[in-house]
């Protein structure tokens, strides 16, 4: 399925011409340009950047570039009434206060409008009480506290370390446990890699560095006030009490210098085991409360942030397709940052900018892609994927009929060790074939393919000689396209060595220290990893938009469906007695997977043999491929999560960042032994097996011969 058959082409206008036009030096220049001042969503600076990108994309040669604006709920600290946490003595005097801001990095001392660290969408409040240390505040951490250690978090302020799971899940878990406030902190065990210096001398987090971030539990809703519909000029907005996903208790993030002051006084129970100990010189006692002489001291939070409906701007660029203009391949990444956005998002935005420039150069030479390519610079991703979700809500009818694929383009790097790809199984073969054609940027792999270095450094746990490709979860702008609309999606970036660097994300994530210099000095001085990511993302878009037959292999879906069915069955089989008692059977699911496998195999055979010169048959076969992902969408959505509609994949209910397979069945089985009504609980398991089996069978039938 070569891309050389693109329209209006001379031989040079192929994938190679597109890739050769991508230049590391340009990406470097764009990154510098995008990172000199903060571009917080809803601010004038970010609006100006949107207009700059619009203007440059037009210059690069796109057919049209428009701004799409929405008025969404955002959250900001009160400029005159800062947020902080204090330790108070028995008289109510504040004997310790946390920092009000991060010490600015060298060269940025005079930059204005650096938003201080805060947890976006925290309600206002000044709770005071005893502290309980809750490790990562995961579901299993609260189970350990409540069930094993008999610690009641009700009415307590909990302190949790960042990492492992999305911060919004931590806050939700704390709320469910009855906490009245949450303090989030970065522990050096998770955000300080051994043997590396702190910024500005290295890429580690200094003690005064703090991770910002939203703490919503939107479950795909987009703007909290207009779930399901665009936040346009005539939108009906919910009252704040009915808003989706807002936390109900105050939350605030701190660095490890401040955390040390809180944790060193902790009393109560010893930590349950070493997995609860970080790297600070404190006992990591769980509490509740402070020990001995400090037992009369309490912790008090002072949170004064406000939620405000604010205008945001997406930039949408169009490169019209020559043959199938009504088929859309979308490349999108966000533009808004917490501060300078040196990695998140501008390392991604700079790559998108260079991809647009390369496509524009080809277009100016008379080339057009077969299908339409849409380029998006999303706003307000950091506030809950708002820009992408509102745009997709506004254009949902077009997207569900015309959307071929969505490629995400947030941060291009989170390390410089190897490639990391998360995508639909439909794209596995595309990614494999593309990376075999690209050169590896890795030291020691000169002259070798990217596929080879990737496979060596990140091998698949199931298939030898193949690289690991992960499930899509959420926490980024592909969410609405994949989880709600069922558009085949993928993402790629360069990552760290997960085996040797066990910290969560990269140490300076969402801090003021995420600067251009961080990237240029420590992560990618030659911008060779950025260039590789540009080639992967751009190459995927090129192939998706240009190949005559869509580069999707439905047989790979069959393989993973069987794997996921085996996995969920083995989870259920931990309860053999109940399965017998309640007549729980997975036969229907395994039968549907078997049918899918057989039908996919036959479809693939027909795909090799059909007459590609017949435009009607070609379109028919491509539509079956395009609509296969759509066939996994259940219009009713998952229980209590109506905007997560994909039956095969959803963000984990316990960690938004992670993908879960057969999420309906998984959630029905989760902690089932603790359910008060086992008959009802197992009834729900049976219902979810039925939904999954039906959906897989229905999807299989979309691949059958049409008549």
């Amino acid at each position: 399925k070569s891309s050389n058959e693109a329209t209006n082409i001379t031989p040079k206008h192929n994938m190679k011409a597109f890739l050769d036009e991508l230049k590391a030096e340009n990406i470097k220049k764009f990154l510098y340009n995008f990172t000199q001042i903060p571009h917080l969503a809803g601010t004038e600076q970010n609006f100006q950047l949107a207009k700059q990108i619009q203007s440059q994309w037009k210059e690069f040669g796109l057919d049209s570039v428009e701004l799409a604006h929405y008025d969404v709920l955002l959250s900001y600290p009160n400029k005159t009434h800062p947020n902080y946490i204090s330790i108070i003595n028995e008289d109510g005097n504040e004997i310790f206060n946390t920092s009000l801001f991060e010490p600015p990095p060298p060269g940025y001392e005079n930059v204005s409008d650096i938003v201080p660290p805060f947890s976006a969408f925290s309600p206002q409040g000044m709770p005071e009480g005893d502290l309980v240390y809750v490790n990562y505040a995961r579901t299993e951490d609260f189970f350990k506290l409540e069930r094993d250690m008999k610690i009641n978090c009700s009415g307590k302020i909990v302190i949790a370390r960042y990492g492992k799971v999305f911060r919004g899940n931590k806050v939700k878990n704390a709320q469910l446990a009855g906490a009245k406030g949450v303090i989030l902190y970065s522990d050096p065990a998770d955000y300080f890699a051994p043997g590396v210096k702190s910024y500005p001398d290295g890429w580690n987090l200094p003690g005064g560095g703090v991770q910002r971030g939203n703490i919503l539990n939107l479950n795909g809703a987009g703007d909290p006030l207009t779930p399901g519909y665009p936040a346009n000029e005539y939108a009906y907005r919910r009252g704040i009490a009915e808003a989706v996903g807002l936390p109900s208790i105050p939350v605030h993030p701190i660095g490890y210098y401040d955390a040390q002051k809180l944790l060193e006084k902790m009393g109560g129970s010893a930590p349950p085991d070493s997995s609860w100990r970080g790297s600070l010189k404190v006992p990591y006692n769980v509490g509740p409360g402070f020990t001995g002489n400090f037992s009369t001291q309490k912790v008090k939070m002072h949170i004064h942030s406000t939620n405000e409906v604010t205008r945001i701007y997406n930039v949408i660029g169009t490169l019209r397709g020559a043959v199938e203009p009504d088929r859309y391949v979308i490349l999108g990444g966000h533009r808004d940052s917490w501060v300078f956005g040196g990695i998140d998002p501008q390392s991604g935005a700079a790559v998108v900018h260079e991809i647009v420039r390369s496509f524009g150069t080809l277009k100016k030479e008379g080339w057009r892609p077969r299908r339409t390519i849409l380029f998006a610079s999303w706003d307000a991703e950091e506030f809950g994927l708002l820009g992408s979700t509102e745009w997709a809500e506004e254009n949902s009818r077009l997207l569900q009929e015309r959307g071929v694929a969505y490629i995400n383009a947030d941060s291009s790097i989170e390390g410089n060790y190897t490639l990391r790809v998360d995508c639909t199984p439909l794209m596995y073969s595309l990614v494999h074939n593309l990376t075999k054609e690209l050169k590896s940027p890795d030291e020691g792999f000169e002259g070798k393919s990217l596929y080879e270095s990737w496979t060596k450094k990140s091998p698949s746990p199931e298939f030898s000689g193949m690289p690991r490709i992960s499930k899509l979860g959420s926490g980024n702008d592909f969410e609405v396209f994949f989880q709600r609309l069922g558009i085949a999606s993928g993402r790629a970036r360069y990552t760290k060595n997960w085996e040797t660097n066990k910290f969560s994300g990269y140490p300076l994530y969402h801090s003021v220290y995420e600067t251009y210099e961080l990237v240029e000095k420590f992560y990618d001085p030659m911008f060779k990893y950025h260039l590789t990511v540009a080639q992967v993302r751009g190459g995927m878009v090129f192939e998706l938009a240009n190949s005559i037959v869509l580069p999707f292999d439905c047989r790979d879906y069959a393989v993973v469906l069987r794997k996921y069915a085996d996995k969920i069955y083995s989870i259920s089989m931990k309860h053999p007695q109940e399965m017998k008692t309640y007549s729980v059977s997975f036969d229907s699911l395994f039968s549907a997977v078997k049918n899918f496998t057989e039908i996919a195999s036959k479809f693939s055979e027909r795909l090799q043999d059909f007459d590609k010169s017949n435009p009607i048959v070609l379109r028919m076969m491509n539509d079956q491929l395009m609509f296969l992902e759509r066939a996994f969408i259940d219009p009713l959505g998952l229980p209590d999560r109506p905007f997560y509609r994909h039956v095969i994949y959803a963000p984990s209910s316990h960690n938004k960042y992670a993908g879960e397979s057969f999420p309906g069945i998984y959630d029905a089985l989760f902690d089932i032994e603790s359910k008060v009504d086992p008959s009802k609980a197992w009834g729900e398991v049976k219902r979810q097996i039925y939904v999954a089996a039906f959906t897989v069978q229905a999807a299989a039938e979309t691949l059958s011969e049409v008549a």
Epitope: F143, D148, M149, K150, G267, G268, D273, N285, G292
Partner: antibody, heavy 116, light 107 residues
Framework: EFQLVQSGAEVKKPGASVKVSCKAS????????MNWVRQAPGQRLEWMGL????????DYNQKFKGRVTITRDTSASTAYMELSSLRSEDTAVYYC?????????WGQGTLVTVSS | DIQMTQSPSSLSASVGDRVTITCKAS??????VAWYQQKPGKSPKLLIY???TRHTGVPDRFSGSGSGTDFTLTISSLQPEDVATYYC?????????FGQGTKLEIK
């Protein structure tokens, strides 16, 4: 219902090793830490260490460090405690106990006798 | 290590008596103390945790109190089935440590 079933009594010679098993049932094995506590005849209970079955990481009482190894087999929902370089004073009943810091569920105990 | 010292080591009381066992920690442990009951030839059973909270199913004649270094287990009205050895345990610091036990008999 929750059950912790330990392996049977052992008689060992000084210098030998013993490995005691503890099979869990009625709950999700990986959700709860497993501890080992011993009791020599007429003596107090003595905490030896624990394992987090989810990660396989063990924490030990320094008194036994180097001699005790706690492991688990999640597929069999079983925890193991191996004590090496046995001496006569290691004669005791060895208990597995589920929990974190405090122990609500105990195995029935395994008597290990060290005698030449 | 934190030493837990119980007193008395043994005691004899009549059915219906109020019985008090004390436990002293060598350093402050806040309220991170549990009490266990062990009958001859049996495994220990959790009675009290967090110094004063009764475990599920434990009769309300058992109560605990204390914080810091001094802790007490009280049986308000001794019953024949309460004949056992009672152990305190601290879980404020590793290694977790137990008292030497108090053997309770019926007169």
């Amino acid at each position: 219902e929750f059950q912790l079933v330990q392996s049977g009594a052992e008689v060992k010679k000084p210098g030998a090793s013993v490995k005691v098993s503890c099979k869990a049932s009625g709950y999700s094995f990986t959700d709860h830490n497993m501890n080992w506590v011993r009791q020599a005849p007429g003596q107090r209970l003595e905490w030896m260490g624990l394992i987090n079955p989810n990660y396989g990481t063990a924490d030990y009482n320094q008194k036994f460090k180097g001699r005790v190894t706690i492991t688990r087999d999640t597929s069999a929902s079983t925890a193991y405690m191996e004590l090496s370089s046995l001496r006569s004073e290691d004669t005791a009943v060895y208990y597995c106990a589920r929990g974190s810091s405090l122990f609500a569920y105990w195995g029935q105990g395994t008597l290990v006798t060290v005698s030449s | 290590d934190i030493q837990m010292t119980q007193s008395p080591s043994s005691l004899s009381a009549s059915v219906g008596d109020r019985v008090t066992i004390t436990c002293k920690a060598s350093q402050g442990v806040d309220t991170a103390v549990a009490w266990y009951q062990q009958k001859p030839g049996k495994s220990p059973k959790l009675l009290i945790y967090w110094a004063s909270t009764r475990h599920t199913g434990v009769p309300d004649r058992f109560s605990g109190s204390g914080s810091g270094t001094d802790f007490t287990l009280t049986i308000s009205s001794l019953q024949p089935e309460d004949v056992a050895t009672y152990y305190c345990q601290q879980y404020s610091r590793y290694p977790l440590t137990f008292g030497q036990g108090t053997k309770l008999e019926i007169k």
